[in-house]
């Protein structure tokens, strides 16, 4: 049975040209985390595998950095980076947990971080 919950950084905003950290945290489960995927829509950005460590998709290598922790850092942001990002925790025996983050990249310097929120 899937008992865990994912806490994410929620809805966030950042300045064009800047960087942002995407963070998720899985709690309330004793399941083993075997891999965490970071995806934008249906595009794989990066993988953090329990055995292999980090793998960044070649098309994002210049602008994506692993960490901190299981998080992901997006750099040199453009307005085109605005959209939904997903952390997918692959666990055993529970299965797949998904967290959602919405990032808005702003032209101005008034970007503020949104509140954290829970996904059941």
């Amino acid at each position: 049975m899937m008992t865990g919950t994912i806490e994410t950084t929620g809805n966030i905003s950042a300045e064009k040209g800047g960087s942002i950290i995407l963070q998720c945290h899985l709690s309330s489960t004793t399941a083993q985390v075997t891999q965490v995927n970071w995806e934008q829509q249906d595009q794989l950005l990066a993988i953090c595998n329990a055995d292999l460590g980090w793998h960044i998709s070649p098309s994002f290598k210049d602008r994506v950095a692993p960490g901190p922790g299981l998080g992901l850092t997006l750099q040199s942001l453009t307005v085109n980076d605005t959209g939904e990002y997903f952390c997918i925790y692959h666990t055993y025996p529970d299965g797949t947990y998904t967290g959602r983050i919405f990032l808005e990249v702003l032209e101005s310097s008034v970007a503020e971080h949104g509140a954290r929120f829970q996904i059941p």
């Epitope: 075997t34 993988i47 595998n49 329990a50 055995d51 292999l52 055993y92 025996p93 299965g95 797949t96």
Partner: antibody, heavy 119, light 107 residues
Framework: EVQVVESGGGLVKPGGSLRLSCAAS????????MSWVRQAPEQRLEWVAE????????FYADTVKGRFTISRDNAKNTLYLQMNSLRAEDTAVYYC????????????WGQGTTVTVSS | DVQITQSPSSVSASVGETITINCRAS??????LAWYQQKPGKAPKLLIY???RLQSGVPSRFSGSGSGTDFTLTISSLQPEDFATYYC?????????FGGGTKLEIK
């Protein structure tokens, strides 16, 4: 070209043991998690076991837990399934399959090896 | 375990037609369903995963849709090589479970 080839199947008596092998080629074996899936005659496919890329995580279906052991030798590009205390209901075609890098499905399968448990 | 009910168990169609195959999960599996094609004596071949993602090299006449508990595989403009058995599989939680299969036959 990605290839996985199973071997080691055969006829065995109930309570007996068998070791299946799966030789992989055409990809970096040590990067991929691997699974065994079986199909009994006239039955649906059944996931049996999985092992992580480095071998540190192993997972089993309840029907085989405690009897089957999945392992791998990355230096030899080979996956194994040690099957002990075999039962008639373990009779099936056993497939070795590669898990996708993003962990979502099984993207390359072998042709299968047949295991028959009968007295 | 998540039970997967696949329908129909067999379907007859002609080259050029469009057919659909359905899978229903006993509880929500989000978008995490894969579709495979298998021909007699051959290894299963991955067609679609995560509900609608087309596996590399698979023709675009194959498409998947659905989320939650109900999913559909559509094959448009059937080709002679498409006549085979199709299986769905949930990859949302362990143990991964499969549908009973749909045999696609030439009418």
């Amino acid at each position: 070209e990605v290839q996985v080839v199973e071997s080691g199947g055969g006829l065995v008596k109930p309570g007996g043991s068998l070791r299946l092998s799966c030789a992989a080629s055409g990809f970096t074996f040590s990067t991929y998690a691997m699974s065994w899936v079986r199909q009994a005659p006239e039955q649906r496919l059944e996931w049996v076991a999985e092992i992580s890329s480095g071998g540190s995580h192993t997972f089993y279906a309840d029907t085989v837990k405690g009897r089957f052991t999945i392992s791998r030798d990355n230096a030899k590009n080979t996956l194994y399934l040690q099957m002990n205390s075999l039962r008639a209901e373990d009779t099936a075609v056993y497939y070795c399959a590669r898990k996708t890098l993003d962990y979502y499905a099984l993207d390359y399968w072998g042709q299968g090896t047949t295991v028959t448990v009968s007295s | 375990d998540v039970q997967i009910t696949q329908s129909p168990s067999s379907v007859s169609a002609s080259v050029g037609e469009t057919i659909t195959i359905n899978c229903r999960a006993s509880k929500s599996i989000s978008k995490y369903l894969a579709w495979y094609q298998q021909k007699p004596g051959k290894a299963p071949k991955l067609l679609i995963y995560s509900g609608s993602r087309l596996q590399s090299g698979v023709p675009s006449r194959f498409s998947g849709s659905g989320s939650g508990t109900d999913f559909t595989l559509t094959i448009s403009s059937l080709q002679p090589e498409d006549f085979a058995t199709y299986y769905c599989q949930q990859h949302n939680e362990y143990p991964w479970t499969f549908g009973g299969g749909t045999k696609l036959e030439i009418k």
